[in-house]
């Protein structure tokens, strides 16, 4: 059952899903100048059986200029760099993920994918919160939110997290503390987290191995 509301907004915090529950949908969005192929599904869907979960349908983008063709346009050098970075991020995140029964991992990028991923979560999904760089967790309970359903209405539980001050960010479950504080890195060497809406993941350039893709907070 789809969650028909959004995870709570925590000031100075972002969230991400470690894995995606079966039933989760991911919009097949294309970058500017490209569109989803006519025969293509508008979504990828996390499906599975008792032993294995995977993403159904593959997102495919084609040039908006190309008529009646599904041929992939070779990206320009700048685009290739962007795509390669996204692949690197995805591989890092996959390495970070635990294989949970009934869950899918982060799907690999597709050619000419949009910079934001829009997910539609289902009841039972858990997302984990982390204070953004420069803020720390002041009051720590479970820094997570779960989509629950009561009387046919969906809601997300309130994460017990308050972000304050100016120290290193807290870590997601299973992530190691960085060797050096990210505060010591120039801004150009860290990824910027842009606030977006409705289960969007902002894929930004990652320059350090400690950087992950985060599902961002809401505006």
């Amino acid at each position: 059952e789809l969650c028909d509301d959004d995870p709570p907004k925590i000031t100075h915090a972002t969230f991400k899903a470690v894995a995606y529950k079966e039933g989760t949908m991911l919009n097949c969005e294309c970058k500017r100048g490209f569109r989803r192929i006519k025969s293509g599904s508008p979504y990828m869907l996390c499906t599975g059986n008792s032993s294995h979960s995977s993403w159904d349908n593959q997102c495919q983008c084609t040039s908006s200029a190309a008529r009646n063709t599904t041929k992939q346009v070779t990206p320009q050098p700048e685009e290739q760099k962007e795509r390669k970075t996204t692949e690197m991020q995805s591989q890092m995140q996959l390495a970070d993920q635990v294989s949970l029964p009934g869950h899918c991992r982060e799907p690999p990028p597709w050619e000419n994918e949009a910079t934001e991923r829009i997910y539609h979560f289902v009841v039972g999904q858990t997302v984990y919160y982390q204070c953004v760089q420069g803020y720390r967790a002041l009051h720590r309970g479970p820094a997570e939110s779960v989509c629950k359903m009561t009387h046919g209405k969906t809601r997300w539980t309130q994460p017990q997290l308050i972000c304050t001050g100016e120290t290193e960010p807290s870590q997601f479950p299973g992530e190691e503390e960085p060797q050096a504080s990210p505060d010591g890195l120039p801004e150009s060497e860290t990824s910027r987290l842009v606030t977006t809406t409705d289960f969007r993941i902002q894929t930004e350039v990652a320059a350090t191995m400690e950087t992950f893709i985060f599902t961002t907070e809401y505006q």
Epitope: E1, D4, D6, G23, H120, V122, K153, T197
Partner: antibody
Framework: QVQLVQSGAEVKKPGSSVKVSCKAS????????MHWVRQAPGQGLEWMGY????????EYNQKFKDKATITADESTNTAYMELSSLRSEDTAVYYC?????????WGQGTLVTVSS | DIQMTQSPSTLSASVGDRVTITCSAS?????MHWYQQKPGKAPKLLIY???NLASGVPARFSGSGSGTEFTLTISSLQPDDFATYYC?????????FGQGTKVEVK
């Protein structure tokens, strides 16, 4: 009490546009998505899409992606759905329905008639 | 898209009859929801998450099922129950409804 009050019936010419409104009261407008459902004469219900009033994010049924544009105005607690390039087959009753799960509250419906 | 097929499309019954409407989904879904609609009125939530009665709905209504097959039952049809009933899934986009079952006077 929760109420969704829609704008009145409209008669439009083919090719024109129409904007249907849905004014919400009795709850926090930005806390629930607003969905739109259409019902052609003598036909069943079809989900068209929704808007998240707090962010402006919209999700559409692909069938209506080029037909409908859903917007919301937080200041007046009103959701809108604009239908463009009207054709006779767009003649229907259009409903807004409060989301957050099952549709527990519905507007009274707005009949849009497209006729030359 | 998940197709929802209701049967029968029209059902002729009398007050006091036990009425059963079935809804078949083209793919497995988590829950089914049911709405009742009377002519010229907006749909009204009847049953949510397969078997739970919405507020104010009489106990003569019940719902059951799982996977792809779901049922709405009215144990003893009352005059107020003559209406059209729709099943609805919100397990995946686009959200879809059944084509409706009209319960009319026999």
């Amino acid at each position: 009490q929760v109420q969704l009050v829609q704008s009145g019936a409209e008669v439009k010419k083919p090719g024109s546009s129409v904007k249907v409104s849905c004014k919400a009261s009795g709850y926090t407008f930005t806390s629930y998505r607003m969905h739109w459902v259409r019902q052609a004469p003598g036909q069943g219900l079809e989900w068209m899409g929704y808007i998240n009033p707090s962010s402006g994010y919209t999700e559409y049924n692909q069938k209506f992606k080029d037909k409908a544009t859903i917007t919301a105005d937080e200041s007046t607690n009103t959701a809108y759905m604009e239908l463009s390039s009207l054709r006779s087959e767009d003649t229907a009753v259009y409903y807004c329905a409060r989301g957050g799960g099952v549709f527990d509250y519905w507007g009274q419906g707005t009949l849009v008639t497209v006729s030359s | 898209d998940i197709q929802m097929t209701q049967s029968p499309s029209t059902l002729s019954a009398s007050v006091g009859d036990r009425v059963t409407i079935t809804c078949s989904a083209s793919s497995s879904i988590s829950y089914m929801h049911w709405y009742q609609q009377k002519p010229g009125k907006a749909p009204k939530l009847l049953i949510y998450t397969t078997s739970n009665l919405a507020s104010g709905v009489p106990a003569r209504f019940s719902g059951s099922g799982s996977g792809t097959e779901f049922t709405l039952t009215i144990s003893s049809l009352q005059p107020d129950d003559f209406a059209t009933y729709y099943c609805h899934q919100r397990s995946t986009y686009p959200l879809t409804f059944g084509q409706g079952t009209k319960v009319e006077v026999k």
